[in-house]
Amino acid sequence: CDLPQTHSLRNRRALILLAQMGRISPFSCLKDRHEFRFPEEEFDGHQFQKTQAISVLHEMIQQTFNLFSTEDSSAAWEQSLLEKFSTELYQQLNDLEACVIQEVGVEETPLMNEDFILAVRKYFQRITLYLMEKKYSPCAWEVVRAEIMRSFSFSTNLKKGLRRKD
């Protein structure tokens, strides 16, 4: 399962698409800035096993996919870019699912500590709540787009876990 390479390639492609999706200048949205508190500290001190890293990455990508698959999202972004971005996310989810299957020989490793998954879900709930409060305004979506780019770039510790043999 050559995940580190395929994942970083797809991740880079997704980031490029996300960057291209920007429609308005981030500077015109400074008043809408928000602290979403990505659960970085929780992950930083933790040594992830391979299946656990896969599990958290899948959670982040699935939640991002959920967020960008809503009707409100369709109205906010250029359709062909949104579709390419969503397709990239879907391919990443497939890669991660297939990787768990290939880890069969070592799969007594638990998939994930529930606390990490809940931390990711709460983070995305905060994003969803923010969008609702801001009535899905163009600036709110711009703030969220920038936030997702940050969270995508973050996952250094998780990627280290992908290289590890369980």
Partner: antibody, heavy 126, light 110 residues
Framework: EVQLLESGAEVKRPGSSVRVSCRAS????????ISWVRQAPGQGLEWMGR????????NYAQNFRGRITITADKSPLTAYLELSSLRFEDTAVYYC???????????????????WGQGSLVTVSS | EIVLTQSPGTLSLSPGEGATLSCRAS???????LTWYQQKPGQSPRLLIY???SRATGVPDRFSGGGSGTDFTLTISRLEPEDFAVFYC???????????FGQGTKVEIK
């Protein structure tokens, strides 16, 4: 919680086609696949295929390729199963089924069927 | 393609007894992707156990799942009258996504 509501029973002639619909309501996401699973009278469950409504991506079981088409509308979230060149052995209850967004971790979510429709009986008879 | 074989085909037991149902795969299956369902006559299947051993919401703790590799089991510690039904195991494989069901084990009242 997701509710899946399927269309009513159908009686069809051999060689014809059938279209079954499945409307999802509740906590639905177009970013999770909707599958079709059938069950012949007194028999077991057989997965036929799935669609990811957000992208329209489909995957079909080998046994049905060439005869099956699954489509979906995103609003309201509805999946459709079309099966052509019907044979007597296609007589079955057709279920739509979907994963749960609440399963922790999400990587398990798409590997199972947490919610099922009530089933739609399709009878192939001459 | 993976084939799941369930045994026995039928299990005749009395309420209060324990039951062990087997699901054997033709090749290695990730236990994370092994699921069990219960189906009563005239009803849709109901999710019971997922990830090999996690109980779905509302499933009593008398139901437990285990196993790895090619051999999986569903155990019901003490059968209640409402437990009598057909039980199916199901695996997931990707890519491409394929869901495979066992042929089912019927647990009937003796």
């Amino acid at each position: 919680e997701v509710q899946l509501l399927e269309s009513g029973a159908e009686v069809k002639r051999p060689g014809s086609s059938v279209r079954v619909s499945c409307r999802a309501s509740g906590d639905t996401f177009s970013s999770y696949p909707i599958s079709w699973v059938r069950q012949a009278p007194g028999q077991g469950l057989e997965w036929m295929g799935r669609i990811l409504p957000a992208l329209g991506v489909t995957n079909y079981a080998q046994n049905f390729r060439g005869r099956i088409t699954i489509t979906a509308d995103k609003s309201p979230l509805t999946a459709y199963l079309e099966l052509s060149s019907l044979r007597f052995e296609d007589t079955a209850v057709y279920y739509c089924a979907s994963p749960s967004a609440d399963i922790i971790p999400s990587i398990l979510g798409t590997t199972l069927f947490a919610f099922w429709g009530q089933g739609s009986l399709v009878t192939v008879s001459s | 393609e993976i084939v799941l074989t369930q045994s026995p085909g039928t299990l005749s037991l009395s309420p209060g007894e324990g039951a062990t149902l087997s699901c054997r795969a033709s090749q290695n299956v990730s236990r994370h992707y092994l699921t069990w369902y219960q189906q009563k006559p005239g009803q849709s299947p109901r999710l019971l156990i997922y990830g090999g051993s996690s109980r779905a919401t509302g499933v009593p703790d008398r139901f437990s799942g285990g196993g790895s590799g090619t051999d999986f089991t569903l155990t019901i510690s003490r059968l209640e009258p409402e437990d009598f039904a057909v039980f199916y195991c199901q695996s997931y494989h990707s890519p491409p996504p394929v869901y495979t069901f066992g042929q089912g084990t019927k647990v009937e009242i003796k």
